[in-house]
């Protein structure tokens, strides 16, 4: 089955610049299918923009000047690129790539969509580092004792833009765990968000990861915040310094835990 | 030009109570098109639910039922037993792929219908309240309460800032909430909750233990090498009524 990944969760540009949005196709040969691009402007219907067929033929929605959007495909990387020239306020939207998932009969195809990339236009000069800054909270002893469960909370602050995705996994597992989250909130010129995960007592001795996708993550990779395995019987440490783990970095955690 | 018009902008549904979404076609006969339904959830993920001719996306067949009412020129999507996972915006869309005539493989979308999910009416349940701390940050975790109306107060004389609470449906069909704040005196911050004309304090849930009975990281699992900005842990301390972890990048 065809699967679409849009690695850029958001793309922030200043007026008149060019935005390039990527869509990676897997499970199907890109040269054997058509890739479609749609946009959803705030408050408007999702609208088809442009498509590129297996033979490179481009089809464009009639209302859009031909040079506004350019679509391409790179078979070597199985990627389709939507280029938006001369970005302006009207281009603020979420852009989705899509393809018809091959099934035997033409009438039985289904169109699958990528997760979307939000185009953000800003006139602000942003600080050098507007990636999410994590703070982690470990389960309170009261919760683990009384409810035989523990809640991990992952707080992310001082990021821009506001588009962020958070999910949780156990170490050495790709299964996404059921978590809950608050709304993204504005704090001065940046944003904050938190997500929490409640696990049963038997899972407390496993390492958990809060995985954060954001446009401004270091090296463009998902940031992994490590929550250490918990034992419900002893010791604390003094939290003086901290660090988080980008995809290839390691992490040392420093903890102070007692009953709450 | 054809237009797909949802019956409602917002549809509140209760967990387990069937709900029906309708979408009418203006300017054309619905029988000339294939109808599709999609759901967009938090984070913009667009998931295929249903396409005419009894085609369902993975995991949707058991809980969703799509239909076309030719006479009324509208498409129908029934959610048979809604759960909190079904919250999102639902879109109808049409195409004529494989129908002959003008070959249009692009989808024409209608505006979304926002489906909000609320727990079923149920006996009132008092919340559990726990405090989690890290440096100046304090989180008040309020678990498994019903009904939704709640006031969460982080009690402190030295508030830096507070954020609006997040209130969500719990997996068991009640409510959970978290309120965050920053305080100079975080060690002494407690949480009190007004719910159902009663007050519940985080201190009601504190476990009286000796100093060796604390949550701690498993030592063998916490020995990763530090990067340059990290320092080795200081000596072990025993601090009462604190639950902290600091991490900055």
């Amino acid at each position: 089955a065809g699967h679409l990944e849009q690695p850029q969760i958001s793309s922030t540009k200043t007026l008149s610049k060019t935005a390039r949005l990527e869509c990676v196709v897997s499970g199907i040969t890109i040269s054997a299918t058509s890739v479609y691009w749609y946009r959803e402007r705030p408050g408007e219907v999702i609208q088809f923009l442009v498509s590129i067929s297996y033979d490179g033929t481009v089809r464009k929605e009639s209302g859009i000047p031909s040079g506004k959007f350019e679509v391409d495909r790179i078979p070597e990387t199985s990627t389709s690129t939507l280029t938006i020239h001369n970005v302006e306020k009207q281009d603020i939207a979420t852009y989705y790539c899509a393809l018809w998932e091959a099934q035997q009969e033409l009438g039985k195809k289904i169109k699958v969509f990528g997760p979307g990339t939000k185009l953000i236009i800003t006139d602000k000069q942003l600080d050098a580092d507007v990636s999410p800054k994590p703070t982690i909270f470990l389960p309170s002893i009261a919760e683990t004792k009384l409810q035989k469960a523990g809640t991990y909370l992952c707080l992310l602050e001082k990021f821009f833009p506001d588009v962020i995705k958070i999910h949780w996994q156990e170490k050495k597992s790709n299964t996404i765990l059921g978590s809950q989250e608050g709304n993204t909130m504005k704090t001065n010129d940046t944003y904050m968000k938190f997500s929490w995960l409640t696990v049963p007592e038997k899972s407390l001795d496993k390492e958990h990861r809060c995985i954060v996708r954001h446009e401004n993550n270091k090296n463009g990779v998902d940031q992994e915040i490590i929550f250490p395995p918990i034992k419900t019987d002893v010791i604390t440490m003094d939290p003086k310094d901290n660090c988080s783990k980008d995809a290839n970095d390691t992490l040392l955690l420093q903890l102070t835990n007692t009953s709450a | 030009a054809i237009e797909l018009v949802p019956e409602h902008q917002t549809v509140p549904v209760s967990i387990g109570v069937p709900a029906t979404l309708r979408c009418s076609m203006k300017g054309e006969a619905i029988g000339n098109y294939y109808i599709n339904w999609y759901r967009k959830t938090q984070g913009n993920t667009m998931t295929f639910i249903y396409r005419e001719k009894d085609i369902y996306g993975p995991g949707f067949k058991d809980n969703f039922q799509g239909d076309i009412d030719i006479a009324k020129n509208l498409a129908v999507l029934k959610i048979l037993a809604p759960s909190e996972r079904d919250e999102g915006s639902y879109y109808c869309a049409c195409d004529t792929l494989g129908m002959g005539g003008e070959y249009t493989d692009k989808l024409i979308f209608g505006k979304g219908t926002r489906v909000t999910v609320e727990p079923r009416s149920q006996p009132h349940t008092k919340p559990s309240v726990f405090v989690m701390k890290n440096g100046t940050n304090v989180a008040c975790l309020v678990k498994e309460f019903y009904p939704k109306d709640i006031r969460i107060n982080l009690v402190s004389s030295k508030k830096i800032t507070e954020f609006d609470p997040a209130i969500v449906i719990s997996p068991s069909g009640k409510y959970n909430a978290v309120k965050l704040g920053k305080y100079e005196d975080s060690n002494s911050v407690t949480c009190s909750v007004q719910h159902d004309n009663k007050t519940v304090h985080s201190t009601d849930f504190e476990v009286k233990t000796d100093s060796t009975d604390h949550v701690k990281p498993k030592e063998t699992e916490n020995t990763k090498q530090p990067s340059k900005s990290c320092h080795k842990p200081k000596a072990i301390v025993h601090t009462e009524k604190v639950n902290m972890m600091s991490l900055t990048v």
Partner: antibody
Framework: EVQLVESGGGLVKPGGSLRLSCAAF????????MDWVRQAPGRGLEWVSS????????FYADSVKGRFTISRDNAKNSLYLQMNSLRAEDTAVYYC??????????????WGQGTMVTVSS | EIVMTQSPGTLSLSPGERATLSCRAS???????LAWYQQKPGQAPRLLIY???SRATGIPDRFSGSGSGTDFTLTISRLEPEDFAVYFC??????????FGQGTKVEIK
Amino acid sequence: EVQLVESGGGLVKPGGSLRLSCAAFGITFSSYSMDWVRQAPGRGLEWVSSIGSSSSYIFYADSVKGRFTISRDNAKNSLYLQMNSLRAEDTAVYYCATSYSWNYGGAFDIWGQGTMVTVSS
Amino acid sequence: EIVMTQSPGTLSLSPGERATLSCRASQSVSSSYLAWYQQKPGQAPRLLIYGASSRATGIPDRFSGSGSGTDFTLTISRLEPEDFAVYFCQQYGSSPPYTFGQGTKVEIK
């Protein structure tokens, strides 16, 4: 049958103004982006300006930027080009054009017959 | 701005002969956005080829387009009397301006 008909051309002095119109027939005008392309006598084609279906996108060639204004009235199925501060080098046949078939990816498959603009003292 | 240069300026051929027209871009152009037009005296241009190699509706199959990157070619396999005209290439994909070549005139020898 889809048809584009230009009007409004004529003789004008340097520094003067002129407004060209393009009426569209047999087309759901409000769904299409529209363009102006000109051709000086004995010369090649030069793209002048482009406007989106709902006027949300407007582009100009550098040679006319600040002097020409493209606009449209979807209720009247009409496209306009307001030309101010005209120069001798603006003398040309002005065509309105559109990409009517979505298959063509933006190439101009429908053209008007053109209207002649002469800038001379 | 992408500059499109056509060669030759004029091509003198007889009916039945093969015509090869060249168009070179000053920088790489996606083949999906390269068009060829035919224009006869006193008439508006007519779209022949879009996407570098796809024929527009109603265009005879003696017209074919090829090329990629910066070099594109229009080939008329057997010239018919009605094919004697001026031919323009155009790139219409990158940010405006959408630029045309200066034209190649195909005349009867």
